[in-house]
């Protein structure tokens, strides 16, 4: 059998196989050692017994989408049946005091691979026996702790495969310089040690995307905005736009990035090299926000100019593209071959990213201030509590609700929260009466809200002992 017979039905064309060469990966035309690594079809009854105590689930994720030329990282996490875990030696053990369907196990081990490998590798002392090999016959890498790595992961995409020895979670990085744009499929098959052979325990696949567009996300924040995720904001208060470029492998680390903004309110174009920008809308309504991001990224070098009289047609661009890996620090898997080499050429190509959003601008509460605090005199005998009136003004729209949060002087531990509806006139002047239990310093957060906005003011107040001579003090505003 060949790798492609074992690993999946996705058969890229001969052209794709030739041009999507992944550095350190091998062609799936290679032979697969079925004696050491048996192959079971889906639905084969043997899967049922491939793992003691149930089935192992493999979860495959990636940091896709990836800008072409950058590295994409894949991670596989194994989920063992209930009450099982991998220990520090790579053995699979039962968790203490954990009860599964079979009850508590007397044997601490599900798989004691340490004992197995000591028994089976005695032949030449190096552990380099005929069975410590991958499905294509390549020997396992023998760095010091390799015996504790008891799972064999075979990654397969674009007509190529990559083999990896690992534990219950592994990461592999691939350079995408030679990967066709668009969605691609990654498939992973996981085997476990079984004496002098291996047993398949899980198969998983996931779609990843390689794109020539810079993946761009924009977060928007505005003070007093009640719900930052509904794309409704307030008039006359600045909105902070923060651009995040999805570039986990830092491919664009040394690129100059330009941000071109159009806010849709006839204020023209705004060009910046800063990933954050503030903009204030002065009219209510709906506006179309557009952002274009431009970066000079490492990219393919153009073909050399054709000679004056070519005797045969020049090759197409696709066959002469050279790629190079950005020299920024990036993620790596567990094999030095996983990162592409850097050829002599160092070409740049402009890459673009786009973001568009429709935002709605409405009236809102812009500001709130406590202008006066009054200790409300209580009849004799003095009770333990104090009543205090806060006189509050606001600007902008008329609030419908007031909340006070009374907490300790650090403003961290909440002691009391009271919210109540309010009926305020156009002048936006209101009095809020609150009770304080005992003397001391309190942090008071006072918020005024309506449907779209929530404005806050804070103050520290010092409530005196119930002595008529002690004045109420605003400790800090």
């Amino acid at each position: 059998k060949r790798f492609h017979d074992v690993l999946g039905n996705e058969r890229p064309s001969a052209y794709m196989r030739e041009h999507n060469q992944l550095n350190g990966w091998s062609s799936d035309e290679n032979d697969w050692n079925e004696k050491l690594y048996p192959v079971w079809k889906r639905g084969d009854m043997r899967w049922k017994n491939s793992w003691k105590g149930g089935r192992v689930q493999a979860v495959l994720t990636s940091d896709s989408p990836a800008l072409v030329g950058s590295n994409i990282t894949f991670a596989v996490n194994l989920i063992f049946p209930r009450c099982q875990k991998e220990d520090a030696n790579g053995n699979i053990v039962y968790e203490k005091n954990c009860r599964n369907e079979a009850g508590l196990s007397a044997d601490p081990y599900v798989y004691n691979w340490t004992a197995w490998s000591e028994d089976s590798d005695g032949e030449n002392g190096t552990g380099q026996s005929h069975h410590n090999v991958f499905p294509d016959g390549k020997p396992f890498p023998h760095h010091p702790g390799w015996r504790r790595w008891n799972f064999i992961y075979v990654f397969h995409t674009l007509g190529q495969y990559f083999q990896k020895l690992g534990r219950c979670s592994v990461r592999v990085s691939v350079n995408t310089a030679n990967v066709t744009l668009g969605p691609q499929l990654m498939e992973v098959t996981v085997y476990r040690r079984h004496g002098r052979a291996y047993v398949p325990i899980a198969q998983v696949k996931d779609v990843y995307v390689v794109t020539d567009q810079i993946p761009v996300f924009v977060t928007m924040f505005q003070k007093n905005d009640r719900n930052s995720s509904d794309e409704t904001f307030l008039k006359d208060l600045p909105i902070m736009f923060d651009v995040l470029i999805h570039d986990p492998s830092h491919f664009l680390n040394y690129s100059t990035i330009n941000y071109k903004w159009s806010f849709g309110d006839n204020t023209g174009l705004f060009v910046s090299t800063n990933h954050t920008v503030n903009h204030t809308y002065v009219l209510n309504g709906t506006f179309s926000l557009n952002l274009t991001v431009k970066a000079a990224a490492p990219g393919p070098c153009p073909p050399p100019p054709p000679p004056p009289r070519p005797s045969k047609p020049t090759p197409s661009l696709a066959t002469t593209l050279k790629s190079y890996d950005s020299n920024t620090p990036g993620p790596a898997g567990d094999n030095p071959l996983e990162l592409s080499r850097i050829p002599d050429e160092n070409c740049q190509i402009n890459r673009y990213g786009h973001f568009q959003a429709t935002i709605t601008i409405v009236e809102g509460i812009l500001e709130v201030n406590i202008i006066q605090m009054t200790d409300v005199l209580m009849p004799v005998p003095w009770p333990e509590s104090s009543l205090i009136d806060f006189v509050v003004t606001c600007q902008g729209s008329i609030p419908t609700e007031v909340c006070t949060i009374i907490s300790d002087p650090t403003c961290e531990i909440t002691q009391n929260t009271v919210c109540s509806p309010v009926d305020v006139d156009e002048m936006c002047l209101l009095t809020v009466r609150r009770t304080f239990n005992g003397s001391g310093t309190y942090c008071v957060n006072l918020t005024l809200g309506d449907d779209t906005s929530l404005a806050l003011t804070s103050t520290l107040i010092s409530v005196p002992d119930r002595d008529p001579a002690s004045p109420l003090r605003m400790a800090n505003s």
């Epitope: 979860v59 010091p144 993620p331």
Partner: antibody, heavy 116, light 108 residues
Framework: EVQLQQSGPELVKPGASVKISCKAS????????MNWVRQSHGKSLEWIGD????????TYNQKIKVKATLTVDKSSSTAYMELRSLTSEDSAVYYC?????????WGQGTTLTVSS | DIQMTQSPASLSASVGETVTITCRAS??????LVWYQQKQGKSPQLLVY???TLAEGVPSRFSGSGSGTQFSLKISSLQPEDFGSYYC??????????FGGGTKLEIK
């Protein structure tokens, strides 16, 4: 016994660079990713990045605007983190931590103060 | 990236009480969640891994539960040495492996 011994506190000026070390002992250095985590005063923990000591491949947290470079010296079982173009916002305690795949052993922390 | 939201941010309790800290992941992380304890001026220490397995030497009054996106750490019969900060962290999939905002547990 597994131990991660970090270098001592650093006081540097804004714009400068610093290199923090983390010497591992009591286990096979190349078997585990080494992570770096920072904690600003009174704040939560932030994952900066990790390095695979077997071949030096590193991954960084894109969200944190820390200009960090992670390296290892396998011969001395030591991991390094170099921080460049420092600002006062980089003042924090920096920890190294061994990953399997969670952080089971941590260094004692290196306090970095960036001040003019 | 996966966001971890921890609550409450702070909590005061008395010795002998039972407290629960919660952690929410922005997407399914299965059981790939850990809890750390950090005392003032010290490094964090592993408390619970795989959402519910106690690390070596951790007293049984600590217990972790949950899977998917909702997790909690329960400390029953609080002891004086339990006061400090607690952090959750995911270790699922590709980096970054983010932490929750932390919970400061103070003595009442």
């Amino acid at each position: 016994e597994v131990q991660l011994q970090q270098s001592g506190p650093e006081l540097v000026k804004p714009g400068a660079s610093v290199k923090i070390s983390c010497k591992a002992s009591g286990y096979t250095f190349t078997d585990y990713y080494m992570n770096w985590v920072r904690q600003s005063h009174g704040k939560s923990l932030e994952w900066i990045g990790d390095i695979n000591p077997y071949h030096g491949g590193s991954t960084y947290n894109q969200k944190i605007k820390v200009k960090a470079t992670l390296t290892v010296d396998k011969s001395s079982s030591t991991a390094y983190m170099e921080l460049r173009s420092l600002t006062s916002e980089d003042s924090a305690v920096y920890y190294c931590a061994r990953n399997w795949p969670y952080f089971d052993y941590w260094g004692q922390g290196t306090t970095l103060t960036v001040s003019s | 990236d996966i966001q971890m939201t921890q609550s409450p941010a702070s909590l005061s309790a008395s010795v002998g009480e039972t407290v629960t800290i919660t952690c929410r992941a922005s997407e399914n992380i299965y059981s790939f969640l850990v809890w750390y304890q950090q005392k003032q001026g010290k490094s964090p220490q592993l408390l619970v891994y795989n959402a519910k397995t106690l690390a070596e030497g951790v007293p049984s009054r600590f217990s972790g539960s949950g899977s998917g996106t909702q997790f909690s750490l329960k400390i029953s019969s609080l002891q004086p040495e339990d006061f400090g900060s607690y952090y959750c962290q995911h270790h699922f999939g590709t980096p970054p492996y983010t932490f929750g905002g932390g919970t400061k547990l103070e003595i009442k």
